[in-house]
Amino acid sequence: CKAMHVAQPAVVLASSRGIASFVCEYASPGKATEVRVTVLRQADSQVTEVCAATYMMGNELTFLDDSICTGTSSGNQVNLTIQGLRAMDTGLYICKVELMYPPPYYLGIGNGTQIYVIDPEPCPDSDF
């Protein structure tokens, strides 16, 4: 297993609709053609997997049907979007990149993106 540098933004604020997007960029040491990207969430010293996708360079990222993530790739960049976020989902979202093929296998883990989620204030009832 060889190490690889992964860069991602330090902080992102989710939209009022609970959507957060960030770019995960990796410094590919070789000509990788198959890449696996995993988003991990770290909160209270616990790490959980949010979503993951394996894709062939040039092809779209396809997450599982029940995934809260979508994404696109361009060169050594992956544009990730996480949906359905609520205030309780605030935390550090870490991008993990694995170069699966061809060998050798490379692994890179970013420092994480702190995503802040603020639940919108409920609209007051109004009489018309």
């Epitope: 053609t33 198959e34 696996r36 995993t38 979503c51 993951a52 996708a53 394996t54 894709y55 062939m56 040039g58 092809n59 396809t62 997450f63 599982l64 995934s67 699966m100 093929y101 061809p102 060998p103 296998y105």
Partner: antibody
Framework: QVQLVQSGAEVKKPGASVKVSCEAS????????IHWLRQAPGQGLEWMGI????????TYAQKFQGRITMTRDTSTNTLYMELSSLRSEDTAIYYC??????????????WGQGTTVTVSS | DIVMTQSPSSLSASVGDRVTITCRAS??????LNWYQQKPGKAPKLLIY???SLQSGVPPRFSGSGSGTEFTLTISSLQPEDFATYYC?????????FGQGTKVDIK
Amino acid sequence: QVQLVQSGAEVKKPGASVKVSCEASGYTFTNYYIHWLRQAPGQGLEWMGIINPSGGSTTYAQKFQGRITMTRDTSTNTLYMELSSLRSEDTAIYYCARRDCRGPSCYFAYWGQGTTVTVSS
Amino acid sequence: DIVMTQSPSSLSASVGDRVTITCRASQSISSYLNWYQQKPGKAPKLLIYAASSLQSGVPPRFSGSGSGTEFTLTISSLQPEDFATYYCQQANSFPPTFGQGTKVDIK
């Protein structure tokens, strides 16, 4: 729809070579890896190697290094697997299969119908 | 290479039975496991990918579970067309490797 159509059965003598073809249709040829696998009579599935149709790069299983060659022809969307120095234990059904990925996992979603290769003196 | 071991290697069952097949990996493969069904003279057919996701068109009586090193394929109510050989395959690392197969035949 996606289809992988393989060439017909072959009977070869020990020491000879065999070249199996796999014609792909119904998708963008260069967008998916093709793997070759084989299955000896009554046995399980054995992975032989992979080819990237986009650039033609290959990786072979250690067991077959030196006597296997995978190639592709992008003008006809056809892949080839040639195995040389055949011996009786190479008698098997040879499959081409397309590798697809969904979520984190990749799998063989589409297979050729198989090509039976018999090695006998 | 990761070694995949299936058990049992064969089993006899009746229509309507609940059948469970186990697959073990020689090291952790997270949830990167696929299951295939193969009938005599035919190519394998993908049933389940990513340990528990049902491939499109596969009947819901098939289900998969597990993570790490131990996985199971369950057929909730065996049908006549389910008598076949089943293979697990790891997709965690290169190269892909298969279990030796489990043959399900009629009791």
